[in-house]
Amino acid sequence: VEVQVSEDPVVALVDTDATLRCSFSPEPGFSLAQLNLIWQLTDTKQLVHSFTEGRDQGSAYSNRTALFPDLLVQGNASLRLQRVRVTDEGSYTCFVSIQDFDSAAVSLQVAAPYSKPSMTLEPNKDLRPGNMVTITCSSYQGYPEAEVFWKDGQGVPLTGNVTTSQMANERGLFDVHSVLRVVLGANGTYSCLVRNPVLQQDAHGSVTITGQPLTF
């Protein structure tokens, strides 16, 4: 028996369902009574789901996994993972034994889009050209860690005096805070781009300083 899985990682959004594809080619006359199917976490060997003894043994992984029972006899050993969490990320091994056996691993990459950044300025009044200001760009609830880029109004990257921190919350999602310290010109626009490297999703925020008032 030859097991086939997708070579590319499966990308799943947090709180959505994901399908880890695994298939085998059953011989003519194949019956489910002959099938032993085991899904494990590749690294720890923890059991995720199994089909043995002619029956679905059920989820062994937080009761969020399911097979496709009607498709098993056709050689579809795929695993459905419901309500994906950050902690589900990793490699899963699909092991199939009929008369002989084979296994293959499929990777799950979890992702969550970042929110539109909010911009704050300190100080935020009585600003004069030549003042040093701190601009903070905050974006929330994304995964994995973001890439943050700053640009001025002409699109020129601002790399000096940037401090970016990323903190994971209890769900493993990241809140990003990036601080740019800059000397004000006569007027200017400062843009922050928060990029999710897996989703290739960009979230933009900007602040324009034109004397008073400020526009965000």
């Epitope: 085991i38 060997k45 059991l47 043994q57 059920g58 062994a60 092991f95 034994s97 056996f101």
Partner: antibody, heavy 123, light 107 residues
Framework: EVQLVESGGGLVQPGGSLRLSCAAS????????MGWVRQAPGKGLEWVSS????????EYADSVKGRFTISRDNSKNTLYLQMNSLRAEDTAVYYC????????????????WGQGTLVTVSS | DIQMTQSPSSLSASVGDRVTITCRAS??????LAWYQQKPGKAPKLLIY???SLQSGVPSRFSGSGSGTDFTLTISSLQPEDFATYYC?????????FGQGTKVEIK
């Protein structure tokens, strides 16, 4: 008939080494995961280590990690356990056991066991 | 690690009695629980796997039930050869862990 026969046990001083062997017969050895389970005198059973059919996966109990090494020779139908830096608490009967499938870990319970070999660590 | 707790630790029974041994896991092991019988100086012998599947060659008086965290091994009519120590083992995740054993003695 599935048969597993352990050998290599004996008396060894603390800090010493032993190599246990398990000769398998009555089944296609290379189609199954294998493992070692031990039982201290008058005590219960403790899983020690497991190895997959092709030796690609090897797992160890925390209590022996870094000291014990599991291996297999499919051409000789033999399972091994190299035990180094032995301690008094390693004193036990060591059983060789067959996993019911080729892989190890979750879902791969042991279905056949050998009679065991006694390892005594004492000065 | 998953902790397995068996009860009772020992029991006395007579031939023909119905005997029940329980095993509790510290977290769900789904259906991946096995029962072994061990006689003095002998190797453990698999009786039940996947909670309720009877191993080939094991008498039908042995049965298993349960799911998740609570499991039971039942011997419907105890026979002289059944006096032994019984262990449960979870095989959901490594390290595999065993109950402390239940010794079944002759009353």
């Amino acid at each position: 008939e599935v048969q597993l026969v352990e050998s290599g046990g004996g008396l060894v001083q603390p800090g010493g080494s032993l190599r246990l062997s398990c000769a398998a017969s009555g089944f296609t050895f290379s189609d199954y995961g294998m493992g070692w389970v031990r039982q201290a005198p008058g005590k219960g059973l403790e899983w020690v280590s497991s190895i997959s059919w092709d030796s690609s996966s090897k797992e160890y109990a925390d209590s022996v990690k870094g000291r014990f090494t599991i291996s297999r020779d499919n051409s000789k139908n033999t399972l091994y356990l190299q035990m180094n830096s032995l301690r008094a608490e390693d004193t036990a009967v060591y059983y060789c056991a067959r996993a019911w499938i080729a892989i190890i870990g979750g879902g791969a319970h042991f279905d056949y066991w050998g009679q065991g070999t006694l390892v005594t660590v004492s000065s | 690690d998953i902790q397995m707790t068996q009860s009772p630790s020992s029991l006395s029974a007579s031939v023909g009695d119905r005997v029940t041994i329980t095993c509790r896991a510290s977290q769900s092991v789904s259906s991946h629980l096995a029962w072994y019988q061990q006689k003095p100086g002998k190797a453990p012998k698999l009786l039940i796997y996947l909670t309720s599947s009877l191993q080939s060659g094991v008498p039908s008086r042995f049965s298993g039930s349960g799911s998740g965290t609570d499991f039971t091994l039942t011997i419907s009519s105890l026979q002289p050869e059944d006096f032994a120590t019984y262990y449960c083992m979870q095989s959901k995740s490594l390290p595999f862990t065993f109950g402390q054993g239940t010794k079944v003695e002759i009353k």
